[in-house]
Interface confidence: low
């Protein structure tokens, strides 16, 4: 390998290096590759040099494109026609000189917070891009469209948030915001201007015209209207609170809708149960006042008994299925009909036929195995399914099974 690299001169972004060649193993060295390592890099990285390609007869090079105020060490690797040799021992560690910062914070945004606050946030500039000691941020903001920027200096490289509090800040009003950088060398650039909204106030009016209806034993649907009159808080969506009559209101469940949606479905409820519901508008500041509470009773559960005694027979490209009638219990919804679900043995999608009889005729090709199941349906939803019946592919003209 080449002998240890010497750093002859260092600036904020360049380093002048020199080295002595090592043995070439009887094959002339054709080029040298310069590598650098910093506390922030993952291992050794190739760096750009002047000249761009360092030939085997050149023993000096200038490394360019370094970050200011970062500790570097360098090494060289020789190459010939046979391949790449062992790297040299690393140079001493040297820090580049300081310079004005050039990188601005990423993702300047904000919003939220408490009344009369403007919250501004950003991603901090990594240490290796701060270019010097005494790094900090300049937060500039102004009411949208105004001429004069208000400035705040935060002398901390770790700062990522600034909150401006003033009674004159109106709820959810737009501010133009930018965040600049500085260090001991002076001020760097500002980030692009972005629009950030001050903290909003929660909605001041409740939703109107609440209505709920039962869809099944487990599902209900709730409808409401936007608040009537001037609502001071922006509405981001609505929060529906619901609880069973037998439970306490403080244990109520909540679901949220987003945007203009003024209805929602609530699922996984208990059958034949009385539920109470109320609706509030919400935004990032919180929820507004609650609507009046409405009541709805879920429908009776569907029949628990599956269809039994299923008999099938086939002839003339038809499968005829018969089964016993399902009788609902007193606390169950009346049977309105039956769903016959069938699919080919090797096909995943299921077809459904509805009937209010206890038999059905299917016209199905006989060159496939079929899987069939039957379940009752009611106002309370679908009841229990029968066990799956496999009807094998039929080559003869008549077959039966149960």
């Amino acid at each position: 390998p080449p002998e240890a690299v010497t750093i002859d001169e260092i600036t904020d972004t360049t380093a002048q290096l020199s080295w002595r060649p090592g043995p070439d193993n009887h094959s002339p060295i054709t080029m040298y590759v310069i590598q650098a390592r910093t506390p922030f890099s993952v291992g050794w990285q190739a760096v750009n040099t002047v000249p761009d390609l360092v030939d085997g007869k050149t023993f000096t090079a200038t490394v360019v494109g370094l970050n200011p105020w970062v500790e570097y060490e360098f090494r060289t690797v020789a190459a010939n026609v046979i391949g790449i040799g062992e790297p040299s021992r690393p140079s001493e560690k040297r820090r580049t000189e300081e310079a004005l910062p050039e990188v601005t914070p990423a993702n300047v945004s904000g919003g939220g917070g408490s009344k009369s606050e403007l919250v501004i946030t950003w991603e901090t500039v990594p240490e290796e891009l701060q270019n010097g000691r005494g790094f900090g941020y300049v937060v500039a903001f102004r009411p949208h469209g105004k001429m004069i920027w208000m400035l705040t200096v935060l002398a901390s490289a770790d700062a990522s948030r600034y909150v401006f509090r003033n009674e004159s800040v109106r709820p959810f009003s737009p501010f133009e915001v930018k965040v600049g950088v500085f260090n001991n060398k002076g001020e760097g650039p500002f980030s692009p201007t972005t629009l950030v909204y001050s903290a909003e106030e929660e909605p001041t009016k409740p939703p109107a015209s609440i209505f709920a209806r039962s869809l099944s034993a487990t599902d209900i649907e709730v409808f409401w209207a936007s608040p009537i009159g001037k609502n001071r808080g922006r509405i981001q969506g609505y929060e529906v609170k619901y609880w069973r009559h037998d439970d306490k209101e403080e244990n109520a469940k909540k679901i949220r809708t987003v945007g203009n949606q003024t209805s929602t479905k609530i699922t996984n409820l208990k059958g034949s149960a009385l539920y109470h519901l109320s609706v509030k508008a919400y935004n990032s500041a919180g929820t507004g006042p609650s609507s009046a509470t409405v009541n709805v009773t879920t429908r009776k559960p569907p029949p628990s008994q599956p269809p039994g005694n299923i008999i099938w027979n086939s002839s003339d490209s038809k499968i005829i299925l018969n089964w016993d009638q399902v009788k609902a219990l007193d606390n169950e919804s009346e049977v309105k009909g039956y769903k016959v679900l069938y699919r080919w043995n090797r096909q995943s999608s299921t077809s459904v036929i509805e009937t209010n009889k206890t038999s059905v005729e299917l016209s199905l090709p006989f060159d496939e195995d079929y899987i069939i199941e039957i379940k009752p349906f009611s106002d309370g939803g679908d009841g229990s399914s029968s066990e799956q019946i496999r009807i094998p592919k039929i080559s003869n003209s008549y077959a039966r099974g149960s």
């Epitope: 009411p143 949208h144 469209g145 105004k146 959810f172 009003s173 737009p174 133009e176 201007t193 972005t194 629009l195 909204y197 936007s226 608040p227 009537i228 009159g229 001037k230 609502n231 922006r234 509405i235 945007g259 203009n260």
Partner: antibody, heavy 123, light 101 residues
């Protein structure tokens, strides 16, 4: 499909009054801020007035403040512009327009426009 | 006050950029063809409404917004207006007449 149909334009003398209407359909009218925007013959667009979805807040361009009144009747899905003390420089095609959002703060985004109604102020 | 160049021309299939400068932090762009109502083509500086071809794009830096049409078509010949907010009222730029050669 959003539809906005303006009416009420015509010829009026300087100092006179006119009331424009805009019938809206195809969206929840009361949920959206609405605008009037005008365009003088051969000229660019000029924002005239804005009203919040519930009708509680209104905003006006300096050139029309105190002379024009924007209002809405959410039960009829209709937007209005009452124009008083009309001047020759008010001559323009007046467009009814719908905001893109339920709420509009900062720069308005106009998602849909009517075809416009011509107002001519001349003696 | 939002400022636009009065007229810009572009060769068919080439790229053109229309700029708008002023004090607004959030811009929209509207296309208007003769005798028709305007159509929103870009909102909130960079977002394209559904139905608008992807050759239209928007950007913003500081107090300047740009509308770029990559691969201009004959049907893109129109007046283009930027819209924004000056802190108290909504405003439109003076408009840029785009000619496709």
């Amino acid at each position: 499909e959003v539809q906005l149909l303006e009416s009420g334009g015509g010829l009026v003398q300087p100092g006179g009054s006119l009331r424009l209407s805009c019938a809206a359909s195809g969206f929840t009218f009361s949920s959206f801020n609405m605008f009037w925007v005008r365009q003088a013959p051969g000229k660019g667009l000029e924002w005239v007035a804005e009203i919040s979805g519930g009708g509680g807040s209104t905003w006006y361009a300096p050139a029309v403040k105190g002379r024009f009144t924007i209002s809405r009747d959410n039960s009829k899905n209709t937007l209005y512009l009452q124009m008083n003390s009309l001047r020759a420089e008010d001559t323009a095609v007046y467009y009814c327009a719908k905001s893109a959002d339920t709420w509009s703060y900062g720069a308005a985004t106009i998602q849909a426009w009517g075809q416009g109604t011509l107002v001519t102020v001349s003696s | 006050e939002l400022t636009q160049d009065p007229a810009v021309s572009v060769a068919l299939g080439q790229t053109v950029r229309i700029t708008c400068s002023g004090s607004s932090g959030s811009y929209g762009w509207y296309q208007q063809k003769p005798g028709q109502a305007p159509v929103l083509v870009i909102y909130d500086n960079t977002n394209r409404p559904s139905g608008i071809p992807d050759r239209f794009s928007g950007s913003s830096s500081g107090n300047t917004a740009s509308l770029t049409i990559t691969g201009a078509q004959a049907e893109d010949e129109a007046d283009y207006y930027c819209g924004g907010y000056d802190g108290s009222t909504d405003v439109f730029g003076g408009g840029t007449k785009l000619t496709v050669l």
